[in-house]
C-alpha cells in the first residue's frame, strides 16, 4: 500500500493499486519511438534501441510496431496503456511475456505489432510462428 506518510491523490493514474492497496511497479520498456530498421525476413530481431525507459503509468506495457513500405522499414518501441488502442488496434497480447508480432491490415504497407509485459520484452521482437502458442504443434511439443 502507499504508506500513511505518502499522500493519496485523487484521480491519478500514475499509481495502480490492487484491492489490498498494494502498489504496482511500472514496466521497463525499450522506448525509442520510431527508428529506421534493417529487420526484414527474419524469425526475430533485436530492437537496437539503447533507451530503456520507465513507463510513466504502471498499467502500461511494452509495444513494438514494425512497418514496411516501398521506401523503408521502421521499428517503433514505446510504452502504452493496453486499455487504449494503439495505431487503432487493441493490444490483445499485452499479458504475454514475449513480443510476438502479429500482422495487422493497413493499406499501402506491411504492418506488424506486438505487446508484452516483462521487462524490456520489446527489445526482442519475434515474427516466427513457432513462438506462437496458439500453434497446436507447439503445444504438443510443450506437453510431451
Amino acid at each position: 500500500t502507499i504508506p500513511p506518510h505518502v499522500q493519496k491523490s485523487v484521480n491519478n493514474d500514475m499509481i495502480v493499486t490492487d484491492n489490498n492497496g498494494a502498489v504496482k511497479f511500472p514496466q521497463l520498456c525499450k522506448f525509442c519511438d520510431v527508428r529506421f530498421s534493417t529487420c526484414d525476413n527474419q524469425k526475430s530481431c533485436m530492437s537496437n534501441c539503447s533507451i530503456t525507459s520507465i513507463c510513466e503509468k504502471p498499467q502500461e506495457v511494452c509495444v513494438a510496431v514494425w512497418r514496411k513500405n516501398d521506401e523503408n522499414i521502421t521499428l517503433e518501441t514505446v510504452c502504452h496503456d493496453p486499455k487504449l488502442p494503439y495505431h487503432d488496434f487493441i493490444l490483445e497480447d499485452a499479458a504475454s511475456p514475449k513480443c510476438i508480432m502479429k500482422e495487422k491490415k493497413k493499406p499501402g504497407e506491411t504492418f506488424f505489432m506486438c505487446s508484452c509485459s516483462s521487462d524490456e520484452c520489446n527489445d526482442n521482437i519475434i515474427f516466427s510462428e513457432e513462438y506462437n502458442t496458439s500453434n497446436p504443434d507447439l503445444l504438443l511439443v510443450i506437453f510431451q
Epitope: 500500500t1 504508506p3 489490498n20 492497496g21 498494494a22 502498489v23 511497479f25
Partner: nanobody
Framework: EVQLLESGGGLVQPGGSLRLSCAAS???????RMWWVRQAPGKGLEWVS?????????YYARSVFGRFTISRDNSKNTLYLQMNSLRAEDTAVYYC?????????????????WGQGTLVTVSS
Amino acid sequence: EVQLLESGGGLVQPGGSLRLSCAASGFTFTEYRMWWVRQAPGKGLEWVSAIEPIGNRTYYARSVFGRFTISRDNSKNTLYLQMNSLRAEDTAVYYCAKQMPGQKWMAKSRFDYWGQGTLVTVSS
C-alpha cells in the same frame, strides 16, 4: 527491521543541482532493485529512476532522462540520486523503494518498502 532513510533534499534554484541519498538497513541490499519515486504536492507517485542490484544497469523516466543520475554503493548499502538542471516541476517529496527480482507489486507495509522521504523544492 527494514529501514530506508532518505536525505539531501532542500531548496534549490532552477538550473541547480542536488544529490539525494538513501541509507538502507535490515535487508540484503545487493538482492534488490532500488527505485527513486517522487510525489509532487497534490499529485500521485511518479517513478523516477531504478538501478539493478548488480551490474548497475540504470533506468529513467523520460521526464528526467539526461538530467538525473542514479547510482548505488553496495559496500555502504546506500542509494544515490544526482539531480542536475532542476526545474520547478521537479519539486516533490522523493522516496527510495526496493523491489525484489520479478516482484510486480509492493506489499502493504509502511516500512518494508518505503522511506519517509526527503523534500526537494525548486524555486527562485
